[in-house]
């Protein structure tokens, strides 16, 4: 009996530009002889319903139809027909099919590959055209994919050390698509510093599918109006 097993859940998520390994494990009742078996990987894009060959391995020959695509002969011996794709791009997301032939048997499995890009975040202070004691703080998130993103603002005071979400005077602009397919967005917070306590910490909080934990950038309001300082930012998708 010949069986193929793909990633549990049927979906794999990978960061943009990563060297991704798309899993495909072979289960066979006898030891595998790689010289008498075949592996073919196919890809179907999200936009076109046409399947194309990515890689094939037959006995003493292998061929990559996508530059750098490879199945390890050394891993194949122990039943691992996973496909390595170096430098994965956004447009390579879609359905991947692993087809295994151990004559006369054939088995196959499919998996959805999602490619994500983590946002970079930075805080800017814009005082141009602002009234006295009024400041506009901008939180720029750039280079993310997919488009869906959530940006919120929080503040912590010495009286209330737990973060409180700010809903007033927040404007989040439209997402802008970059040439490489990633997106940018800016969220603005308008503050009247005369009405705020010195020592108040403000945070821009970015939540995105590519991030395990939100990306936080903060600044502290000082007696001298403001002190803009970006704390450690975590871009930790893995």
């Amino acid at each position: 009996d010949l069986k193929v097993e793909m990633m549990a859940g049927g979906t794999q998520i990978t960061p943009l530009n990563d060297n991704v390994t798309i899993f495909c494990n072979i289960f066979y009742s006898q030891p595998l002889n790689i010289t008498s078996m075949g592996i073919t990987w196919f890809w179907k894009s999200l936009t076109f319903d046409k399947e194309v060959k990515v890689f094939e391995f037959f006995g003493d020959h292998q061929e990559a139809f996508r530059p750098g695509a490879i199945v390890s002969p050394w891993r194949l011996k122990s039943g691992d027909a996973s496909l390595r794709l170096p430098g994965i791009q956004l447009e390579e997301a879609g359905e991947y099919r692993c087809e295994v032939v151990v004559t006369p048997l054939k088995a196959q499995g499919t998996v959805q590959l999602e490619v994500v890009a983590s946002p970079a975040s930075r805080l800017l202070l814009d005082q141009v055209g602002m009234k006295e004691n009024e400041d506009k703080y901008m939180c720029e998130s750039s280079g993310f994919y997919p488009e869906a993103i959530n940006i919120t603002w929080e503040k912590q005071t010495q009286k209330f050390p737990h973060p409180i979400e700010i809903s007033e005077d927040v404007i989040t602009g439209p997402t802008i698509k970059n040439m490489d397919g990633t997106f940018n967005v800016t969220s603005c917070l308008k503050l009247n510093s005369s009405q705020e306590d010195p020592g108040t910490v403000y945070q821009c909080v970015v939540r995105h599918a590519s991030l395990h934990t939100p990306l936080r950038s903060n600044f502290t309001l000082t007696a001298a109006r403001h002190s803009l300082s970006e704390t450690e930012k975590t871009d930790n998708f893995s």
């Epitope: 060297n19 899993f23 490879i70 390890s72 050394w74 891993r75 122990s78 039943g79 691992d80 996973s82």
Partner: antibody, heavy 120, light 111 residues
């Protein structure tokens, strides 16, 4: 920085088993296989087998089949090699080595070695 | 199993001179246009260190005085200008077939 840190020296009696560990750091553990190679005193190198951390699949040198068991714990990036029914000629330094498997096959980083002495 | 035979067993070369070690395989270690032959250096009390893989590719961080050549069954490791720190035992290894096998080693000394 890639590092493979092996467990300490062992002294065993004939017939016993030994389990050597190899803790990996500085790279994605599942992207490479782990080879196990041994070297008897004053002798050359002998490949014992390898394990694929991606699926736990193993390939053993026929010489050791039935006596060797290779396992991994991916949650702590650690590989293990257990050799049973030890004999005096199993006295050797046992090495784990990270093995590239996609673009050729070679052991590019090695552990410091674990000395196993089998003596009654 | 593929048997690898290194020659010579030991070699003494003067500092600055060329050192050549040969490795002969009992059958071809070529597959799909590549040669699966690797070379390692081992100094006393240390683990082996990768020098060359795929017959001729220099591993990162290895000085370019080391080079590898050959295909099929005959391979050569060359040190163009011997340095004192090159004193070691050198092993060839094939990775085309299991079990992966090593040569018996060549001990390189300074004359």
């Amino acid at each position: 920085e890639v590092q493979l840190v092996q467990s300490g020296a062992e002294v065993k009696k004939p017939g016993a088993s030994v389990k050597v560990s190899c803790k990996a750091s500085g790279y994605t553990f599942t992207d490479y296989n782990m080879d196990w190679v041994r070297q008897a005193p004053g002798q050359g190198l002998e490949w014992m087998g390898d394990i694929n951390p991606n699926n736990g699949g193993t390939l053993y040198n026929q010489k050791f089949r039935g006596r060797v068991t290779m396992t991994v714990d991916t949650s702590i990036s650690t590989a293990y090699m257990e050799l049973s029914r030890l004999r005096s000629d199993d006295t050797a330094v046992y090495y784990c080595a990270r093995s590239e498997v996609f673009y050729g096959n070679y052991a590019d980083y090695w552990g410091q070695g674990t000395t196993v002495t089998v003596s009654s | 199993d593929i048997v690898l035979t290194q020659s010579p067993d030991s070699l003494a070369v003067s500092l600055g001179e060329r050192a050549t070690i040969n490795c002969k395989a009992s059958q071809s270690v070529d597959y799909d246009g590549d040669s699966y032959m690797n070379w390692y250096q081992q100094k006393p009390g240390q683990p082996p260190k990768l020098l060359i893989y795929a017959a001729s590719t220099l591993h990162s961080g290895i000085p370019d005085r080391f080079s590898g050549s050959g295909s099929g069954t005959d391979f050569t490791l060359t040190i163009s200008s011997l340095q004192a720190e090159d004193v070691a035992v050198y092993y060839c290894q094939q990775s085309k077939e299991d079990p992966r096998t090593f040569g018996q080693g060549t001990k390189l000394e300074i004359k």
